[in-house]
């Protein structure tokens, strides 16, 4: 017989999720309306295509990328979709409440949907560190807290540091990584005897994870250029991201082989490292003046990613309880930092003629921005972790970590729990 959802969760999840959805519908009813103005058809189509690319990245890319566990692939994909759907709704409302509420109603445009999808993507990056150890009710809490924290971070950074949409969204990499790692740190860590096999990867799920990586790889230029309005900057961002991810693929595959004693290629390294260039180039993708720089950055990012995948999992597994195949968290944390450092280096190079005081001030501003993103990520992540530990959520027992059968109906399986 197939296992059933624990009774307590069966009572808790539908009530919690549907009540929340009803509340969101009411908020949309009272506070939102569509943009009634006329946008030219060509601009509308182009804007929609970018939004569509972001949705593909989120639903298929990140959904499948996290599906490599032997017995947790269904949950990874479906829970990702659930979080994306919920996250986008809340992010649209939050963006409206934080930025435009004084003007009355929240106006929904394709641009606000784009912002919301990118905000929801943050949760999908973070959740890689905790998938398999939490149930849907807990994930709902994580979505709400993280989207709220990111929305507030973006507003604060925008107001204090005068950043544009692209720049304050590009902190998503470090924010999502540190948020996810701090949540993971709070959750019960030791895997009990007999569950070690569940966090191992399997061939078919690994193939679907590779599919996810390919979708992300294809659409990463859209992500990095999505919020840039200047045509010349958008073009630079697309080109630079493309070159960076192209080089990081080559580096990932060859670096993975180099890191193995028998020269074999690790699936886990490749899943993650193919995206390295896109993350590292994100913050400064529109500023990099020539392809070779983006390519060098892709190379360095690929090497860091492979190196991190080889040496960090042991530490992360011990300290944070993150399984070996969930390397997105520390990968993005390192590569996001690399991206921010590159941005600061480019800023320094461009301000050399402006006097030391000006350079110092600008570097200080950039470091302040980055520090704020990390601090808010860690604090809100710890808060989320503490919330997720509350008994009311009926978290899966450690013995049932990384197990689809806790959540899904498999009529053909005779394994009971």
């Amino acid at each position: 017989m197939s296992s059933k959802y624990p009774r307590s969760v069966r009572r808790c999840l539908p009530l919690w999720a549907l009540t929340l959805e009803a509340a969101l519908i009411l908020l949309f009813y009272f506070f939102t309306h569509y943009d009634a103005s006329l946008e030219d058809q060509k601009g509308l189509v182009a804007s929609y295509q970018v939004g569509q690319d972001l949705t593909v990245m989120a639903a298929i890319g990140l959904g499948f990328l996290t599906s490599s566990f032997r017995r947790h692939s269904w949950s990874s994909v479906a829970f990702n979709l659930f979080m994306l759907a919920l996250g986008v709704q809340w992010a649209i409302l939050l963006d409206g409440f934080l930025s435009q509420f004084p003007s009355g109603k929240v106006v929904i445009t394709l641009f606000s949907i784009r912002l919301a999808t990118m905000s929801a993507l943050s949760v999908l990056i973070s959740v890689d560190a905790v998938l398999g150890k939490v149930n849907l009710a807990q994930l709902v809490v994580m979505v709400l807290v993280e989207v709220t924290a990111l929305g507030n971070l973006r507003m604060v950074i925008s107001n204090i540091f005068n950043t544009d949409y692209h720049m304050n969204m590009m902190h998503i990499y470090v924010f999502a990584a540190y948020f996810g790692l701090s949540v993971a740190w709070c959750l019960p860590k030791p895997l009990p005897e007999g569950t070690e096999d569940k966090d191992q990867t399997a061939t078919i799920p690994s193939l679907s994870a590779m599919l996810g990586a390919l979708f992300l790889w294809m659409f990463w230029p859209s992500f990095n250029s999505a919020l840039l309005r200047s045509p010349i900057e958008r073009k630079n961002a697309v080109f630079n991201t493309y070159y960076a991810v192209a080089v990081s693929v080559v580096t990932a595959i060859s670096g993975s082989s180099l890191a193995h004693p028998q020269g074999k290629i690790s699936k886990t390294y490749v899943h993650s490292a193919v995206l390295a260039g896109g993350v590292a180039v994100g913050t400064s993708c529109h500023l990099i003046p020539s392809p070779w720089l983006a390519m060098v950055l892709g190379l360095v990012a690929g090497l860091i990613s492979v190196g991190g995948a080889k040496y960090l999992p042991g530490c992360c597994n011990r300290v944070l309880g993150i399984p070996h195949s969930s390397i997105m968290g520390y990968n993005f944390s390192l590569l996001g930092l690399l991206g921010e450092i590159i941005y600061i280096v480019l800023l320094v190079l461009d301000t050399v003629g402006a006097g030391n005081g000006m350079i110092g001030f600008q570097v200080l501003l950039s470091i302040g921005e980055l520090s704020l993103a990390i601090v808010i990520a860690l604090m809100s992540g710890l808060l989320t972790g503490l919330l997720l530990n509350l008994k009311i959520w009926k978290a899966p027992h450690e013995a049932k970590y990384f197990d689809d059968q806790v959540f899904w109906k498999f009529p053909h399986l005779a394994v009971g729990f």
Epitope: T109, N162, L287, T351, Q362
Partner: antibody
Framework: QVHLQQWGTGLLKPSETLSLTCAVH????????WTWIRQPPGKALEWIGE???????NYNPSLKSRVTMSADTSKNQFSLKLTSVTAADTAVFYC??????????????????WGPGTTVTVSS | DIQMTQSPSSLSASVGDRVTITCRAS??????LVWFQQKPGIAPKRLIY???SLQSGVPSRFSGSGFGTEFTLTISSLQPEDFATYYC?????????FGQGTKLEIK
């Protein structure tokens, strides 16, 4: 303190090419976009386009076929060329500091520092 | 292109009056709007950026508000030096576009 100094041909005949240059003094040329704006007599302002230090430019589609902008980092100068001028191009042309390429570096919307303007008259 | 429509196109007021100028965008521009003041024969001067942030050095009697498509510039108590032409500019999408201007005259 940043200030802009501009110069160029003031009187042109129809079909000639307008050429204007703007020099940036006391600011970080590489950090900003640099903008050209024009104002026909008694009319509103019109954004012509912007350029960065490496020559990346965004133009107003209504003028794109006739406009070329360039930047000279060694001299901290940027220039505007407008070909095939007609009487409708008679205007005061302003150069201005545009938005920052980096966040936090002045406000990114720019247009906070302007040149004095150059009056260009197109007449046969 | 995004059209910016200012109203009124001209306005007569006295010193000490409270004056409001409106700018309407043909599509949502969030808060990516700047207000300028221009006096005859002189280059425009930036007063407000990001729809509501006051440029340093500009008197506090000037204020801006709005989000999306409707924006206002308010002068709480007109001074003799405030009589000029006022323009709004959107920088949400390319090409940047200005309003047609509002000429503020002495009554």
């Amino acid at each position: 303190q940043v200030h802009l100094q501009q110069w160029g041909t003031g009187l042109l005949k129809p079909s000639e090419t307008l050429s204007l240059t703007c020099a940036v003094h006391g600011g970080s040329f590489n950090v900003y976009y640099w903008t050209w704006i024009r104002q026909p007599p008694g009319k509103a302002l019109e954004w012509i386009g912007e350029i960065n230090h490496s020559g990346g430019a965004n133009y107003n589609p209504s003028l794109k076929s006739r406009v070329t902008m360039s930047a000279d980092t060694s001299k901290n100068q940027f220039s505007l060329k407008l070909t095939s001028v007609t009487a409708a191009d008679t205007a005061v042309f302003y150069c201005a500091r545009g938005r920052s390429r980096y966040s936090g570096y002045g406000f990114y919307s720019g247009m906070d520092v302007w040149g004095p303007g150059t009056t260009v008259t197109v007449s046969s | 292109d995004i059209q910016m429509t200012q109203s009124p196109s001209s306005l007569s007021a006295s010193v000490g009056d409270r004056v409001t100028i409106t700018c309407r965008a043909s599509q949502v521009i969030r808060n990516d709007l700047v207000w300028f003041q221009q006096k005859p024969g002189i280059a425009p001067k930036r007063l407000i950026y990001a729809a509501s942030s006051l440029q340093s050095g500009v008197p506090s009697r000037f204020s801006g508000s709005g989000f999306g498509t409707e924006f206002t510039l308010t002068i709480s108590s007109l001074q003799p030096e405030d009589f000029a032409t006022y323009y709004c500019l959107q920088h949400f999408s390319y090409p940047y576009t200005f309003g047609q201007g509002t000429k503020l005259e002495i009554k």
